[in-house]
């Protein structure tokens, strides 16, 4: 299974200090992964290469994303990317890419969280994306 | 074979101007790779995807890591990641990720070197890690 | 098929506001990919993991690279990496890595473009490289 996702939109709930991205498939091979709003549901357990990039346009001193999984009654951070940002708006433009190999369980929900309220993201599909490759 | 490693600790020898990371397996499939203190020993020769991320909290003007291999009487750089760092300690927070595909030989020792004495690293397992996927 | 490429040189045509990199193979397995000057020709259609890193030594406010494909009469951006750069030349040193999974067609030409005239790149093979893994 292979899945490459690109953004539909990004939102912060009113009382939340995080921003989440809603995803849609750009490339899909196999049935083992299912885009589901702000998350991706794992249908086939196994070892996956996961990758995530977010394009930030924000003067907040550091920006980044956390890729986490929720399943079997608990939430776990898999990996994160952190980028210090310039304070000048014209210069505050950075992509943050990270990736890793993890064992995912059937029913896990994977999500990308930016731990900032109303984070200023560029949702271009070549700047912000999320992907899975079953190994 | 698949191996995803996370840090145990990082040290600079007294007379050394580099910082090295000691690794432990977080995910392991197959017997082809063996964590060995500050290095990873290749048991099965072949073509591997290698990836490395280090999370820096350091105001030194540029930080980064070098992934190198030692084997058959030679040491060589495989790839490197470089990140310019802000001079203000509160802002100096950057992850540096890189990866590539390389032919590794039996007996090679792979290591991650930060070419700075006493580099200030964040050894969180979701911020600093090292991985191998046999292709 | 696997292909890891390193730079031969980088040039900007006189009237152009982009810099392109000419590539040579460092590791090659299979016949499905062919380095061809500033591009890589796809011989075998399929789903590929592509990765790209460029090492910048440039004080231009933001630097980065675009990985695009040309084929079937059109050009398409696959992914890009963006890095804000310090204004001081001694600090302006950043690698920019990105990667993703894409379906490539026979005859496609893949290239790495830096959308800056005469971009100051470090063409060390460990800092600037391009790779493909057929999944």
């Amino acid at each position: 299974s292979v899945l490459h996702l690109v953004p539909i939109n990004a939102t912060s709930k009113d009382d939340s200090d995080v921003t989440e991205v809603m995803w849609q498939p750009a490339l899909r091979r196999g049935r083992g992964l299912q885009a589901q709003g702000y998350g991706v549901r794992i249908q086939d357990a196994g070892v996956y290469l996961l990758y995530s990039q977010v394009l930030f346009q924000d003067v907040t001193f550091t920006m980044g994303q956390v890729v986490s999984r929720e399943g079997q009654g608990r939430q776990e951070t898999l990996f994160r990317c952190i980028r210090s940002m310039p304070s000048h708006p014209d210069r505050a433009y950075n992509s943050c890419y990270s990736a890793g190999v993890f064992h995912l369980h059937q029913g896990d929900i994977l999500s990308v969280i930016i731990p900032r309220a109303r984070a200023k993201l560029n949702l271009s599909p070549h700047g912000t994306f999320l992907g899975f490759v079953k190994l | 074979s698949v191996l995803h490693l996370v840090p145990i600790n990082a040290t600079s020898k007294d007379d050394s101007d580099v910082t090295e990371v000691m690794w432990q397996p977080a995910l392991r499939r197959g017997r082809g790779l063996q964590a060995q203190g500050y290095g990873v020993r290749i048991q099965d020769a072949g073509v591997y995807l290698l990836y490395s991320q280090v999370l820096f909290q350091d105001v030194t003007f540029t930080m980064g890591q070098v992934v190198s291999r030692e084997g058959q009487g030679r040491q060589e750089t495989l790839f490197r990641c470089i990140r310019s760092m802000p001079s203000h300690p509160d802002r100096a927070y950057n992850s540096c990720y890189s990866a590539g595909v390389f032919h590794l030989h039996q007996g090679d020792i792979l290591s991650v070197i930060i070419p700075r004495a006493r580099a200030k690293l964040n050894l969180s397992p979701h911020g600093t890690f090292l991985g191998f996927v046999k292709l | 098929s696997v292909l890891h490429l390193v730079p031969i040189n980088a040039t900007s045509k006189d009237d152009s506001d982009v810099t392109e990199v000419m590539w040579q193979p460092a590791l090659r397995r299979g016949r499905g990919l062919q380095a061809q000057g500033y591009g890589v020709r796809i011989q075998d259609a399929g789903v590929y993991l592509l990765y790209s890193q460029v090492l910048f030594q440039d004080v231009t406010f933001t630097m980065g690279q675009v990985v695009s494909r040309e084929g079937q009469g059109r050009q398409e951006t696959l992914f890009r990496c963006i890095r804000s750069m310090p204004s001081h030349p001694d600090r302006a040193y950043n690698s920019c890595y990105s990667a993703g999974v894409f379906h490539l067609h026979q005859g496609d030409i893949l290239s790495v473009i830096i959308p800056r005239a005469r971009a100051k790149l470090n063409l060390s093979p460990h800092g600037t490289f391009l790779g493909f893994v057929k999944l």
């Epitope: - | 030692e70 058959q72 060589e76 030989h105 070419p115 | -």
Partner: antibody, heavy 121, light 112 residues
Framework: QVQLQQSGPELVKPGASVKLSCKAA????????INWVKQSPGQGLEWIGW????????KYNDKFKGKATMTADKSSSTAYMQLSSLTSEDSAVYFC??????????????WGQGTSVTVSS | DVLMTQTPLSLPVSLGDQASISCRSS???????????LEWYLQKPGQSPNLLIY???NRFSGVPDRFSGSGSGTDFTLKISRVEAEDLGVYYC?????????FGGGTKLEIK
């Protein structure tokens, strides 16, 4: 472009030590090993050893252990080789050479101009 | 140590002639990975050595195509198809497969 600039000629007394330098430019110093090679007068070439500046690791030809000590200073992109307890047998030209390690080969692709060491009382 | 023996010691040639230099190793210079790190270097009078050939037969960038390397195991050859004046000097073979790495004794290419 890649350059290796070696220090000037040395005239030293028997039993003394000498430290030769090799300043690198035009590439990332820590990414490539520096080899040292000896050429005695009218003779061929002998490999002394290498240092990898990225980690400080070294590999010596057993013949030169105790005679040669290789070091590297990353801040100045300079490799050094100290020769100790000098005798007339150590009179030679010493070369530093960068070893490349990509595009499928290893080889000493760039060389310094050499430093002449003469041991004489 | 691997002993590298070059023949001849001296090779007088006329400009435009072909020249051939042999290098024989005391044991195989194939390393445990299956790679043969056999190189050829040219040292012109008063200069540093220059890399000509790596991994038996691959020309280094900028080296004219009149230079070619061949061989395997313990027997290697460097050929110059048409000798030019700038080719004069001492040619060394070198093995980087087994530590300590070793050079041949050299072959001096000179004008007849």
């Amino acid at each position: 472009q890649v350059q290796l600039q070696q220090s000037g000629p040395e005239l030293v007394k028997p039993g003394a030590s000498v430290k030769l330098s090799c300043k690198a430019a035009g590439y990332i110093f820590t990414d490539y090993t520096i080899n040292w090679v000896k050429q005695s007068p009218g003779q061929g070439l002998e490999w002394i050893g290498w240092i990898y500046p990225g980690s400080g690791n070294r590999k010596y030809n057993d013949k030169f252990k105790g005679k040669a000590t290789m070091t590297a200073d990353k801040s100045s992109s300079t490799a050094y080789m100290q020769l100790s307890s000098l005798t007339s047998e150590d009179s030679a030209v010493y070369f530093c050479a960068r070893e490349s390690n990509y595009v499928g080969y290893y080889a000493m692709d760039y060389w310094g101009q050499g430093t002449s060491v003469t041991v004489s009382s | 140590d691997v002993l590298m023996t070059q023949t001849p010691l001296s090779l007088p040639v006329s400009l435009g002639d072909q020249a051939s230099i042999s290098c024989r190793s005391s044991q195989s210079v194939v390393n445990s990975n299956g790679n043969t790190y056999l190189e050829w270097y040219l040292q012109k009078p008063g200069q540093s050595p220059n890399l000509l050939i790596y991994k038996v037969s691959n020309r280094f960038s900028g080296v004219p195509d009149r230079f070619s390397g061949s061989g395997s195991g313990t027997d290697f050859t460097l050929k110059i198809s048409r000798v030019e004046a700038e080719d004069l000097g001492v040619y060394y073979c070198f093995q980087g497969s087994h530590v300590p790495w070793t050079f041949g004794g050299g072959t001096k290419l000179e004008i007849k």
